[in-house]
């Protein structure tokens, strides 16, 4: 029985040219995480973190994607094309598969600075 839940950073915005951390957290289960897959909005695979064999990054993103922190993923040098959905898929034993969704909006620098000024601390 799958008792766990995935918590994500939800809907986030970041500045064009900047960086952002995509983070999912699996809680309420003792299941062992065997692999985490990070997919982009078009369902292309960005990165894999295998429990035994470590991180693997899609070659086209090697310069812009950094593993971590933890099981998360850091996207750097953001472009407007990075806007969209991102999915974390947690493969676990014995529970099975958990999936989380994050929506990233990349904003033009001036817009991002403006919206940041009005965020509640």
């Amino acid at each position: 029985m799958m008792t766990g839940t995935i918590e994500t950073t939800g809907n986030i915005s970041a500045k064009k040219g900047g960086s952002v951390i995509l983070q999912c957290h699996l809680s309420s289960t003792m299941a062992q995480v065997t692999q985490v897959n990070w997919e982009q909005h078009d369902h292309s695979l960005l990165a894999i973190r295998n429990a035994e064999l470590g991180w693997h990054i899609y070659p086209a993103f090697k310069d812009r994607v950094a593993p971590g922190p933890g099981l998360g993923l850091t996207l750097q040098s953001l472009t407007m094309n990075d806007t969209g959905e991102y999915f974390c898929t947690y493969h676990t034993y014995p529970d099975g598969t958990y999936r989380g969704r994050i929506f990233l909006e990349v904003l033009e620098s001036s817009v991002a600075e403006h919206s940041a000024r009005f965020q509640i601390p």
């Epitope: 692999q35 897959n37 894999i48 295998n50 693997h56 899609y58 493969h91 598969t97």
Partner: antibody, heavy 117, light 106 residues
Amino acid sequence: EVQLVQSGAEVKKPGASVKVSCKASGYTFTEHSIYWLRQAPGQRLEIIGRIDPKNGRTYFVDKFKNRATLTTDTSASTAYMELSSLRSEDTAVYFCARIDGFYFDFWGQGTLVTVSS
Amino acid sequence: DIQLTQSPSFLSASVGDRVTITCKGSQNVNKYLVWYQQKPGKAPKLLIYSTDNLQSGVPSRFSGSGSGTEYTLTISSLQPEDFATYFCYQYNNGFTFGQGTKVEIK
């Protein structure tokens, strides 16, 4: 042209160690991880472990954690796999392979290691 | 980890035949499936990646398809150089291989 050339066949006694080499050419050696895999007679391929030539970091499948050692000589663009405490079940063809993202795009020709008393 | 089962394990065929090999996963492979060709004493050769993408330099008679747990490799017209062993590999959950399918001359 990317090439991985492995050392020749070995015959070892139980309890001994074997060291297999894999010389890479045709690409920048430090830009891709090297995997080591093996195929025992009549069995499917299984992964032993991985080494990142850029920093020497190694990763192992649990089964091989205590017996396998992976190293590289970046100046010679060569990777090495040493397996200790050999037993008859280690008789297999051992492969090195380059990983490109998530799959192996170039492989060595394989090295047959026979463990026999 | 996902277990991959290929069928058939052995296949006898003639030059010009259309050949289909199946690879079935114990769980959803999510299209993260690769096909290799291997000849005795030679390095395995990458044929198809991500289910249906032909690797550069591989003849167009090779094609791949599938989704979920079931995938196929098709050789539209078998050539003399195609007699070999073919195996699948997945990376959706763990990195695992099928047991191989040996294509022999009938």
